[in-house]
């Protein structure tokens, strides 16, 4: 039976060009953790494996770093990262829990508003 | 370059243990992954298991119980055991590398493979 | 476990014409396939990793593609040198298996 639950940082928003963390925490079983894997829609971002590390997938190695922890640092964000991204617990002997962040990326406030600013 | 190179030997009665070693040079066996995977006459490549850098293991469920990878470190080598085998072990084995932070779980190096029969 | 089915088992093709393999997980995988090359009397080379990207020194006439739980391995034009067995691997989660071959032949 699978009596764990995943604790999300939910619904998230960064700005266009910054980074943003996506966190996911098992609690509550105490099966054995073998791997997370990190996804969005049908793009594999990264896989955390106990045993071997982290594999980044090619496509998003220039802008996905691994960490904190289990989770997942994505950098130079633009309009398109937006939406939801999965964080994939296999374990064993449970098998696997999900869990979903849906990330918002808004357009910089400083970006748009940067050139009425002059210093004095 | 890496080499791998399987030893052990060719015939093995059945409900006794095979034992095989592989040979590394050209590297490490304490960075990256190493594997053993078999394919009996006619049938599907089958994953063994693996002992990662660290010296930790992971053994396909089918075979759990049944199979020990261990590693000699001062001799870069490492090796399988397999127990109580059945004609049904009869196979190519193949140790590997996997160089999981690069390629995740593709195998980018393989040994030439090593014929063993199950027979009385 | 996860199970690769490959198309079809065997395939005969003649030079310079292109070759098509198909392989099918019986879960989404996402992008997590390799696939490899295994030419007579040898040892089984890797040719692709994460579903389209070639490994080192494989020529640009092979390509993979797909996602989810269709994966296709091509080669646009097929040589002499290309007789083999070619495999397809999942790696989304273990324990990783891989498809049962297909077998490509020189007419």
């Known amino acids: 039976m699978m009596t764990g639950t995943i604790e999300t940082t939910g619904n998230i928003s960064a700005e266009k060009g910054g980074s943003i963390i996506l966190q996911c925490h098992l609690s509550s079983t105490t099966a054995q953790v073998t791997q997370v894997n990190w996804e969005q829609q049908d793009q594999l971002l990264a896989i955390c494996n106990a045993d071997l590390g982290w594999h980044i997938s090619p496509s998003f190695k220039d802008r996905v770093a691994p960490g904190p922890g289990l989770g997942l640092t994505l950098q130079s964000l633009t309009v398109n990262d937006t939406g939801e991204y999965f964080c994939i617990y296999h374990t064993y002997p449970d098998g696997t829990y999900t869990g979903r962040i849906f990330l918002e990326v808004l357009e910089s406030s400083v970006a748009e508003h940067g050139a009425r600013f002059q210093i004095p | 370059e890496v080499q791998l190179q399987e030893s052990g030997p060719g015939l093995v009665k059945p409900s006794e243990t095979l034992s095989l070693t592989c040979a590394v040079s050209g590297y490490s066996i304490t960075s990256d992954s190493w594997n053993w995977i078999r394919q009996p006459p006619g049938k599907k490549l089958e994953w063994i298991g693996y002992?990662?850098?660290?010296?930790?293991?992971y053994y396909n469920p089918s075979l759990k119980s049944r199979v020990t990878i261990s590693r000699d470190t001062s001799k870069n080598q490492f090796s399988l055991k397999l127990s109580s085998v059945t004609a049904a072990d009869t196979a190519v084995y193949y140790c590997?590398?996997?160089?999981?932070?690069?390629?995740?779980?593709?195998?980018?190096?393989w040994g030439q493979g090593t014929t063993v029969t199950v027979s009385s | 476990d996860i199970v690769m089915t490959q198309t079809p088992l065997s395939l005969s093709v003649t030079p310079g014409q292109p070759a098509s393999i198909s392989c099918k997980a019986s879960?989404?995988?996402?992008?997590?396939v390799a696939w490899y090359q295994q030419k007579p009397g040898q040892s089984p080379q890797l040719m692709i990793y994460s579903a389209s990207y070639r490994y080192t020194g494989v020529p640009d006439r092979f390509s993979g593609s797909g996602s989810g739980t269709d994966f296709t391995l091509k080669i646009s034009r097929v040589e002499a040198e290309d007789v083999g067995v070619y495999y397809c691997?999942?790696?989304?989660?273990?324990?990783?298996?891989f498809g049962g071959g297909t077998k490509v032949e020189i007419k």
């Open positions: 691997q999942q790696y989304y989660t273990t324990p990783w298996t």
């Open positions: 002992i990662s850098y660290s010296g930790n293991t």
């Open positions: 879960q989404n995988v996402r992008t997590a």
């Open positions: 590997a590398r996997l160089d999981f932070s690069n390629y995740g779980g593709a195998v980018d190096y």
